[in-house]
């Protein structure tokens, strides 16, 4: 279960890494993998990567999609390879939701 406390020696998973935070790497290792989409000053920014620390991803992964950001998380080797985060399909435009970042 997602709410379970992490074990003392938590399992690390290999995750696909895409986006600015990855540098030249195409993968990373962490306790959770993620795939995200955010609207940043009008641009759609896609990122994939990992949360090294369980607590780091806990709140982010529980955040429901908003008009400006969506994050999907998973646990398992390469589990984010075929996951593409999608914004909720409500309406066409996004005035007022210009700056969202996945920190």
């Amino acid at each position: 279960m997602e709410d379970e406390k992490p074990k003392v020696n938590p399992k690390l998973y290999m995750c696909v890494c895409e986006g600015l935070s990855c540098g030249n790497e195409d993968h990373c290792e962490g306790q959770q993998c993620f795939s995200s989409l955010s609207i940043n000053d009008g641009f759609h920014v896609y990122q994939k990567g990992c949360f090294q620390v369980y607590e780091q991803g806990k709140m982010t992964c529980k955040t429901p999609p908003s008009p400006g950001q969506a994050v999907e998380c998973c646990q398992g080797d390469w589990c984010n390879r075929n996951i593409t985060a999608q914004l909720p399909t409500k309406g066409k435009s996004f005035p007022g939701t210009q700056n969202f970042h996945l920190e």
Epitope: N40, D41, G42, H44, Y46, Q86, L87, K92, Q98
Partner: antibody
Framework: EVQLVESGGGLVQPGGSLRLSCAAS????????MSWVRQAPGKGLEWVSA????????YYADSVKGRFTISRDNSKNTLYLQMNSLRAEDTAVYYC??????????????WGQGTMVTVSS | EIVMTQSPATLSVSPGKRATLSCRAS??????LAWYQQKPGQAPRLLIY???TRATGIPARFSGSGSGTEFTLTISSLQSEDFAVYYC??????????FGQGTKLEIK
């Protein structure tokens, strides 16, 4: 109705300059990143440049970097492309385009009709 | 830069038949791929986004599939108005946004 209308194309000599405009209507202009995409006669589509909604971030294809400048005036709902040091290979129809439906994830679903730029002596 | 490669360059198919167009990315673009249709003298028209979802107003005979590096656009029963040039484009890793070189679909 969401609409993009380009203007400013024409015939220019190699080394010359030209400024293209794209007038937008029907949406909140400042919320959208916008791009220029070009198509040389008989060739495919080539992304040229993009600018963020506020105008604070700009991006260019390597083929135009240092020669073209993208800008926008959000008070006039207008996108610009300043083209300097023009070359014969810049000859193309220039389109402005936006990913209007935000749930389309960045695909360009709104395009202008295009404006033709011919670079020739 | 991600390179998009389309095949074939030209496809000749009879009206009423099925057409299958391919697009390959030099590295994964997840499902962040679009297909466009362009007719002579017109601007491109978005057909498919997210690799497999039809844009508003696009007929059901158009379908997209694939993820990662291999993508396919299928037109199930070709109508006369479907003969045009088709482009794929990735919007996963930018800049630059990159397009394939196009596939010309012509009447056999």
């Amino acid at each position: 109705e969401v609409q993009l209308v380009e203007s400013g194309g024409g015939l220019v000599q190699p080394g010359g300059s030209l400024r293209l405009s794209c007038a937008a209507s029907g949406f909140t202009f400042s919320s959208y990143a916008m791009s220029w995409v070009r198509q040389a006669p008989g060739k495919g589509l080539e992304w040229v440049s993009a600018i963020s909604g506020s105008g604070g971030s700009t991006y260019y294809a390597d083929s135009v970097k240092g020669r073209f400048t993208i800008s926008r005036d959000n008070s006039k709902n207008t996108l610009y492309l300043q083209m300097n040091s023009l070359r014969a290979e810049d000859t193309a129809v220039y389109y402005c385009a936006i990913p209007y439906n935000w749930n389309y994830g960045g695909a360009f679903d709104i395009w202008g009709q295009g404006t033709m730029v011919t670079v020739s002596s | 830069e991600i390179v998009m490669t389309q095949s074939p360059a030209t496809l000749s198919v009879s009206p009423g038949k099925r057409a299958t167009l391919s697009c390959r990315a030099s590295q994964s673009v997840s499902s962040n791929l679009a297909w466009y249709q362009q007719k002579p003298g017109q601007a491109p028209r978005l057909l498919i986004y997210g690799a497999s979802t039809r844009a508003t107003g696009i007929p059901a005979r158009f379908s997209g599939s694939g993820s990662g590096t291999e993508f396919t656009l299928t037109i199930s029963s070709l109508q006369s108005e479907d003969f045009a040039v088709y482009y794929c484009q990735q919007y996963n890793n930018w800049p630059p946004y990159t397009f394939g070189q196009g596939t010309k679909l012509e009447i056999k």
